[in-house]
């Protein structure tokens, strides 16, 4: 054994000892901020974070002294590899501080962002509770639109300049760490090097995601078509039978999980409800009961109970007006055997399953607690997300719900209840896959520089239409930052983990169900009470990051790579049923339709042909003038023709589909109300009335400033002098 390796071991022992304490202090300060967002807690978190960062930077520099090629022991090698990654510490001190400030500010904006009554600024709605409640339950098109738009307008717009800076700094950090960009840095979590037969490259991840997505697409397209038909019933006249789905109608603020669409889409509504929310409320469940039931599930497969500290220190309900907390559910491994969950739990089936998910993280954290500090992590990020999801697959089954008294003992399973169950599962599991894939693809492209920042929103909604079949209910210009309206984006979390975890969870489920001696279709498997399944899972969990994930996966499922087959097998009966349901429907979507298309007017502008060498450049200022001119025309029309004083502003003239050869569409909304689109016929009358004023503003005429569908005015824009 080389002296280098022995020295490295000694160095790592010392590191592990010191890291434990500093990391704990930093984590604790972070917990305090997340559960109580105050200026003082931000400062404490930053101070503790700075100490941890300085320590890591120093240790990372020291770790460079041990060349990896001279280390034989895999455990030592993996630790050094991890420590030699410099993370943000490669940035200059001022840039590192700036990045920290940006991250904290984005987190605070997201968690404290609110929408307030313009007439009474004291009257506000936070995302949680309030806006999320609307997006989970409302069937009122305009209430949903108001919540959807307000959140993006209030929060997304504030985040935009910060996110632009964040991209630059994170890319700089990644490149200094020898990655192509920050997306590549994130993909590094899946990289395996130097383990014969188990290597996996960052590029391979992109390939695997792309090709598995192609395999999932047919199932998703049929789910999409079915959901579209049901949404047409719920929102008559708001949905196109061949178009994309309006983004604000999809079950939550982001259209990430479609779970809440179940009541609108349930195939066999006369059957007992397998969404057991009502039963939980009737039986007076609370947050504590939800987590205790989740704990029982894990214990039943031979995994450990939560620690006493977990129950004492976790924050499982919204502190309400007492203090402001980050309400997005998170699981915390603070170190020193201190495990906690932060969640503003509501008594719903959705949160019952989320509790299993979060507790899955804690089980993984507890299982690898014996590993060296630097190897205490999931084999890859997707594994960490998959653990609780495996449990949720069992916990959601009618069999399991019956066993814990949430479904009546006389609940009978048949083909119809099976389809109900699978559809509910698909709304959550299948519905989210294109969302996840598209979001991360967009970020990867942004980090790579493939989407210039003056086209972020344009490309976001193009991709959303093409890949997800979802359309923006109102157009968003480049002042918005819609991706950052999601927790994971504004809080700097990679996201492809939710895609990979979904494939892994079905691979794991298949293997664990075999261990549990389950017979019958995969979707009926409930692994609770199977210690064999629990042991098989635990053997993987305890490894943490000490083995390549490809090897860990192979140990459990017998294959080294992600595979979509088990997921497709699980949903096979539903897919067959959906194909039958959709036989008279259009499957797929046209990306041309939008909810505002009917009220839009197309404009074509020909500067060169009209002005020749005197042609000016069409830029943001010209567009501002155009929108102001239309707003003027609207004010004039309402005042002169309708005797109504309505103060239209340029922000009420909404432009979409701007093309470089200068054409675009626009429509007009009532002041301060994005959901109130002024009928196209009214806008046409207003433009006709002020046409010459608009033409003059741009030194153009009816032919060079063309409003398609609006008859040209009678006289030429500039009267020639009478001779």
């Amino acid at each position: 054994q080389s002296t280098i390796e022995e020295q490295a071991k000694t160095f790592l022992d010392k590191f592990n000892h010191e890291a434990e304490d500093l990391f704990y202090q930093s984590s604790l300060a972070s917990w305090n901020y997340n559960t109580n967002i105050t200026e003082e807690n931000v400062q404490n978190m930053n101070n503790a974070g700075d100490k941890w960062s300085a320590f890591l930077k120093e240790q990372s520099t020291l770790a460079q002294m041990y060349p990896l090629q001279e280390i034989q022991n895999l455990t030592v090698k993996l630790q050094l590899q991890a420590l030699q990654q410099n993370g943000s510490s490669v940035l200059s001190e001022d840039k590192s501080k700036r990045l920290n400030t940006i991250l904290n500010t984005m987190s605070t904006i997201y968690s404290t962002g609110k929408v307030c009554n313009p007439d009474n600024p004291q009257e506000c709605l936070l995302l949680e509770p309030g806006l999320n409640e609307i997006m989970a339950n409302s069937l009122d098109y305009n209430e949903r639109l108001w919540a959807w738009e307000s959140w993006r307008s209030e929060v997304g717009k504030q985040l935009r300049p910060l996110y632009e800076e964040y991209v630059v700094l994170k890319n700089e950090m990644a490149r200094a760490n020898h990655y192509e960009d920050y997306g590549d840095y994130w993909r590094g979590d899946y990289e395996v090097n130097g383990v014969d037969g188990y290597d996996y490259s960052r590029g391979q991840l992109i390939e695997d995601v792309e090709h598995t997505f192609e395999e999932i697409k047919p199932l998703y397209e049929h789910l999409h078509a079915y959901v579209r038909a049901k949404l047409m019933n719920a929102y008559p006249s708001y949905i196109s039978p061949i178009g994309c789905l309006p983004a604000h109608l999809l079950g939550d603020m982001w259209g990430r999980f479609w779970t809440n669409l179940y009541s609108l889409t349930v195939p066999f509504g006369q059957k007992p409800n397998i969404d057991v929310t009502d039963a939980m409320v009737d039986q007076a469940w609370d947050a504590q009961r939800i987590f205790k039931e989740a704990e029982k599930f894990f214990v039943s497969v031979g995994l450990p109970n939560m620690t006493q500290g977990f129950w004492e220190n976790s924050m499982l309900t919204d502190p309400g007006n007492v203090q402001k907390a980050v309400c997005h559910p998170t699981a915390w491994d603070l170190g020193k055997g201190d495990f906690r969950i932060l969640m503003c739990t509501k008594v719903t089936m959705d949160d019952f399953l989320t509790a299993h998910h979060e507790m899955g993280h804690i089980q993984y954290d507890m299982a690898y607690a014996a590993q060296p500090f630097l190897l205490r992590n999931g084999a890859n990020e997707g594994f960490h997300e998959a653990v609780g999801e495996i449990m949720s697959l069992s916990a959601a089954t009618p069999k399991h719900l019956k066993s814990i008294g949430l479904l009546s003992p006389d609940f009978q399973e048949d083909n119809e209840t099976e389809i109900n169950f699978l559809l509910k599962q698909a709304l959550t599991i299948v519905g989210t896959l294109p969302f996840t894939y598209m979001l991360e693809k967009w970020r990867w492209m942004v980090f790579k520089g493939e989407i210039p920042k003056d086209q972020w929103m344009k490309k976001w909604w193009e991709m959303k239409r093409e890949i997800v079949g979802v359309v923006e209910p109102v157009p968003h210009d480049e002042t918005y930052c819609d991706p950052a309206s999601l927790f994971h984006v504004s809080n700097d979390y990679s996201f492809i983990r939710y895609y990979t975890r979904t494939l892994y969870q079905f691979q794991f489920q298949e293997a664990l169900c075999q261990a549990a001696k389950h017979e019958g279709p995969l979707h009926k498997c409930d692994i609770s009470n199977s210690t064999e399944a629990g042991q098989k899972l635990f053997n993987m969990l305890r490894l943490g990051k000490s083995e390549p994930w490809t090897l860990a996966l192979e140990n459990v499922v017998g294959a080294k790579n992600m595979n979509v087959r088990p997921l497709l097998n699980y949903f096979e009966p539903l897919f067959t049923w959906l194909k039958d349901q959709n036989k008279n429907s259009f499957v797929g979507w046209s990306t041309d339709w939008s909810p505002y298309a009917d009220q839009s007017i197309k404009v074509r502008i020909s500067l060169k042909s009209a002005l020749g060498d005197k042609a000016y450049e069409w830029n943001d200022n010209e567009m501002y003038l155009f929108r102001s001119s239309v707003a003027y025309a609207m004010r004039q029309y309402f005042l002169k023709v309708k005797n109504q004083m309505i103060l239209f502003g340029e922000e009420d003239v909404r432009v979409a589909n701007l093309k470089p050869r200068i054409s675009f569409n626009f429509f007009v909304t009532a002041p301060k109300n994005v959901s109130d689109i002024i009928p196209r016929t009214e806008v046409e009358k207003a433009i006709r009335m002020s046409r010459s004023r608009i033409n003059d503003a741009f030194r153009l005429n009816d032919n060079s400033l063309e409003f398609l569908g609006i008859q040209p005015t009678l006289g030429p824009p500039n009267q020639p002098p009478v001779s």
């Epitope: 009554n117 313009p118 709605l125 806006l131 609307i134 989970a136 409302s138 009122d140 209430e143 009502d278």
Partner: antibody, heavy 121, light 109 residues
Framework: QVQLVESGGGLVQPGGSLRLSCAAS????????MSWVRQAPGKGLEWVSA????????YYADSVKGRFTISRDNSKDTLYLQMNSLRAEDTAVYYC??????????????WGQGTLVTVSS | GIVMTQSPATLSLSPGDRATLSCRAS???????LAWYQQKPGQAPRLLIY???NRATGIPARFSGSGSGTDFTLTISSLEPEDFAVYYC??????????FGQGTKLEIK
Amino acid sequence: QVQLVESGGGLVQPGGSLRLSCAASGFTFSSYAMSWVRQAPGKGLEWVSAISGSGGSTYYADSVKGRFTISRDNSKDTLYLQMNSLRAEDTAVYYCAKATTVVTPGYFDYWGQGTLVTVSS
Amino acid sequence: GIVMTQSPATLSLSPGDRATLSCRASQSVSSSYLAWYQQKPGQAPRLLIYDASNRATGIPARFSGSGSGTDFTLTISSLEPEDFAVYYCQQRSNWPPITFGQGTKLEIK
């Protein structure tokens, strides 16, 4: 089918208190905002108060702010209106109404039959 | 709050006639946020029209709504005997207060 049944109305002296209840059935109660709307004898409709589906947001007309309190018990599918410091001008039929919305005040697609509150000495 | 003014206060027409009821807001109201209700003596109000022009479930096609900005109209194309009642317009915005018009009484001539 949706049903809303008000109770608790009656004769009360000025300055007195009364608590109205509205028992709901036929829909997922916690998923909708609810309101109280009143109608003085021979007069038009006046919105009084609203509460979001979870009970997290409450709204009041200026005329009752500080005197009336709206609340709900989702486990019992029941809406309440606690009326204190009652005045003669609070005399009206009080309707419980289901909103089409969840959090913001909305339209009212279902109404109860009303309960009469008379404030008189 | 926004004041809703209905006109006329009373409208006397015969069955088969066309009825046009008007509602004017003191400031601009989103057409997404205007409704009409019908109330018969001794009964609770009933939602007729929402979002200015959409008929509520079970409402006959003879009822229609239109308008934007500050001026809104409820039209009953051909009056049936059961249509004689009081009609109220209501504005809801995203924040309270909700306000109703004072009502138009539609009576048999």
